[in-house]
């Protein structure tokens, strides 16, 4: 919908998790409500209670099975609906069909660390997350180094337009505390969006030898 | 941008049927949400049903549960309301309107609006 004050937004993990978003200016806050979930081509089906993250916000996680199990494929839809407690009965708010493979966000990277620290460089490596085997090699990364005296919004961002789980940052200062993370995107589409940013990995440059020029 | 053209509204008497239909066009036809809506004169515009485009599924207004009925032929991009049944009450513009992505949360907030088409029921 155009209009941003009500909207119904999902994205699926890839593996068994679909997030969803529900938005809505004016909505009753003590109203009980929750996400349906109904396969086209699936014997499931699956609910959660939708839960406040702000003041006309809420969101919940359809689990649809163990974290890494694959339970939906690229020719799935999965009807999704929004429905909230009227007296004794459940009234339908919103409604979409919602096409798993067109509308993916990964789990944030995970596990990284410091493979090896230098005075001016660092090679860091990762891992990604119940994605899925679909993907093969159709991911790209993007990451980013907190500097001293910076904030994360000004770190400029390095692309990896392949599955490349690791990185080599280059022209580093001497005995320096740094940030890193990374985040995930699948190729394939058309409303697909990054992942979360991974937890920060905190690390620091080896000092300049002693008499030498840095 | 998708456009919504209205057809098949008229004078019809009480108890009577009727058929209408709403030609869709653009580019993200194939993934939105096709919405029947009325206004009656002097009276806010209300929801009547909805249907998604890809698996058909359905959510009517009360007030039509049962008489009114929506469907969609994805080949000829076109979805329909069946009005059965009619009442006075029923006399209304009737608009077609679509969402596409991201959804609405909300059934009564649409992106696009068709010019509507009358429909009259005389007692």
């Known amino acids: 919908a155009v209009n941003g004050t009500s909207q119904f937004t999902c994205f699926y993990n890839s593996r068994a998790n679909i997030s969803c978003v529900w938005s809505q200016d004016g909505a009753l806050q003590d109203t009980s409500c929750q996400v349906h979930a109904w396969p086209d081509r699936r014997r499931w089906n699956q609910t959660c209670e939708l839960l406040p993250v702000s003041q006309a916000s809420w969101a919940c996680n359809l689990i649809l099975g163990a974290p890494d199990s694959q339970k939906l494929t690229t020719v799935d839809i999965v009807t999704l609906r929004v429905l909230c407690r009227e007296g004794v009965r459940w009234r339908v708010m919103a409604i979409q069909d919602f096409k798993p493979f067109e509308n993916l966000r990964l789990m944030a990277p995970i596990s990284l660390q410091v493979v090896h620290v230098e005075t001016h460089r660092c090679n860091i490596s990762w891992e990604i997350s119940q994605a899925s085997h679909y993907f093969e090699r159709h991911l790209e990364f993007e990451a980013r180094t907190l500097s001293p005296g910076h904030t994360w919004e000004e770190a400029p961002l390095l692309t990896l337009k392949q599955k490349q789980e690791w990185i080599c940052l280059e022209t580093l200062t001497p005995d320096t505390q740094y940030e890193f993370q990374v985040r995930v995107k699948p190729l394939q589409g058309e409303f697909t969006t990054w992942s979360p940013w991974s937890q920060p990995l905190a690390f620091r440059t080896k000092p300049a030898a002693l008499g030498k020029d840095t | 941008q998708v456009q919504l053209v209205e057809s098949g509204g008229g004078l019809v008497q009480v108890g009577d049927s009727l058929r209408l239909s709403c030609a869709a066009s653009?580019?993200?036809?194939?993934?939105?949400?096709m919405g029947w809506f009325r206004q009656a004169p002097g009276k806010e515009r209300e929801f009547v049903a909805v249907i998604t485009w890809s698996t058909g599924s359905t959510v009517y207004a009360d007030s039509v549960k049962g008489r009114f009925t929506i469907s969609r032929d994805n080949a000829k991009n076109t979805v329909y309301l069946d009005l059965s049944s009619l009442k006075p009450e029923d006399t209304a513009v009737y608009y077609c309107?679509?969402?596409?992505?991201?959804?609405?949360?909300?059934?009564?907030?649409?992106?696009?609006w068709g010019k509507g088409t009358q429909v009259t029921v005389s007692s």
């Open positions: 653009g580019r993200t036809v194939g993934s939105a949400n």
């Open positions: 309107a679509a969402d596409v992505y991201p959804y609405s949360g909300n059934l009564n907030i649409m992106d696009y």
